[in-house]
């Protein structure tokens, strides 16, 4: 299969900026490349086909170029409606592989997350499972790392993260990380902690609780 690699995965920009997204194919696809724009909850919209041909109705600020293995999509002057995720797709072969996407986000000022930790509810514990939630509120940029520690032992593979869309007012994100354990495992341990790192924080922030004391 032909692999498609897009970069960057996130692009921070302001209205009026000129932005360029790159797409590389693992082997030559001539000019059999399309670009799509997708907004949350909506179907992808075709912008460009055959690398540089503008789809009807698409503004001329979208410019496609390239051939062989290297392609670019340039937005000459970013407009408010252009904040979205962009995908390249090759259609030289049957697999019609997509790139992994580039999210064009509103460039905000750096904001460190406010961090909160929530133990499982008594109601949930009755069902035999325990979910501990670490909430990161109102941070920018989106890159943040959450590490779970149980009795100071690093946890891996038993947590899931969910990130909100960028807030339209202040350009921040919020994230929840959920550590899921069986009730039996939860009750074997005492100290539950989430450690958060983000570029707005000079040092990691740790929030914790002692089971049975909250």
């Amino acid at each position: 299969d032909i692999q498609m690699t897009q970069s960057p995965s996130t692009l921070s920009a302001s209205v009026g900026d000129r932005v360029t997204i790159t797409c590389r194919a693992s082997q030559s696809i001539n000019t059999w490349l399309a670009w799509y724009q997708q907004k949350p909850g909506k179907a992808p919209k075709l912008l460009m086909y055959k690398a540089s041909s503008l789809e009807s109705g698409v503004p001329s600020r979208f410019i496609g170029s390239g051939s062989g293995t290297e392609f670019t999509l340039t937005i000459s002057s970013l407009q408010p409606d252009d904040f979205a995720t962009y995908y390249c797709q090759q259609y030289n072969s049957d697999s019609k592989m997509f790139g992994q996407g580039t999210k064009v986000e509103v460039k905000g000022t750096v904001a460190a997350p406010s961090v909160f930790i929530f133990p499982p509810s008594d109601e949930q514990l009755k069902s035999g499972t325990a979910s501990v939630v670490c909430l990161l509120n109102n941070f920018y940029p989106r890159e943040a790392k959450v590490q779970w520690k149980v009795d100071n032992a690093l946890q891996s593979g038993n947590s899931q993260e969910s990130v909100t869309e960028q807030d339209s007012k202040d350009s921040t994100y919020s994230l929840s990380s959920t550590l899921t354990l069986s009730k039996a495992d939860y009750e074997k341990h005492k100290v539950y902690a989430c450690e958060v790192t983000h570029q707005g924080l000079s040092s990691p922030v740790t929030k914790s609780f002692n089971r049975g004391e909250c």
């Epitope: 940029p141 790392k145 000079s202």
Partner: nanobody, 126 residues
Amino acid sequence: QVQLQESGGGLVQAGGSLRLSCAASGRTSSIHLMAWFRQAPGKEREFVASIIWTGGTTYYAGTTFYGDSAEGRFTISNDNARNTGYLQMNSLKPEDTAVYYCAATSLENPTRYDYWGQGTQVTVSS
């Protein structure tokens, strides 16, 4: 390991300018992001600005970020050939008085500041 050394601090009048430098040595190829923080007496260390030094998968190298206090007045930049980061500070105010620290994250831990300089004092007089 990466070593960071700041320079360029000093005494300046309100409305004036200063350029801080941060010279990196050691495993500089492992730097992902370089940032400036500042700490005024009795206050917490505050983020000022950052620049992506070596692009990972997320942002292009050269992408810049600013804190509220710096936006519009300060400019962060770097010179990879010289392994040096810069913070150009214009329209300085007395409230910008602080010790300014250079910090860096690594490609392995791109959101954690594992490396810090010793700091350089900036004093803005009214």
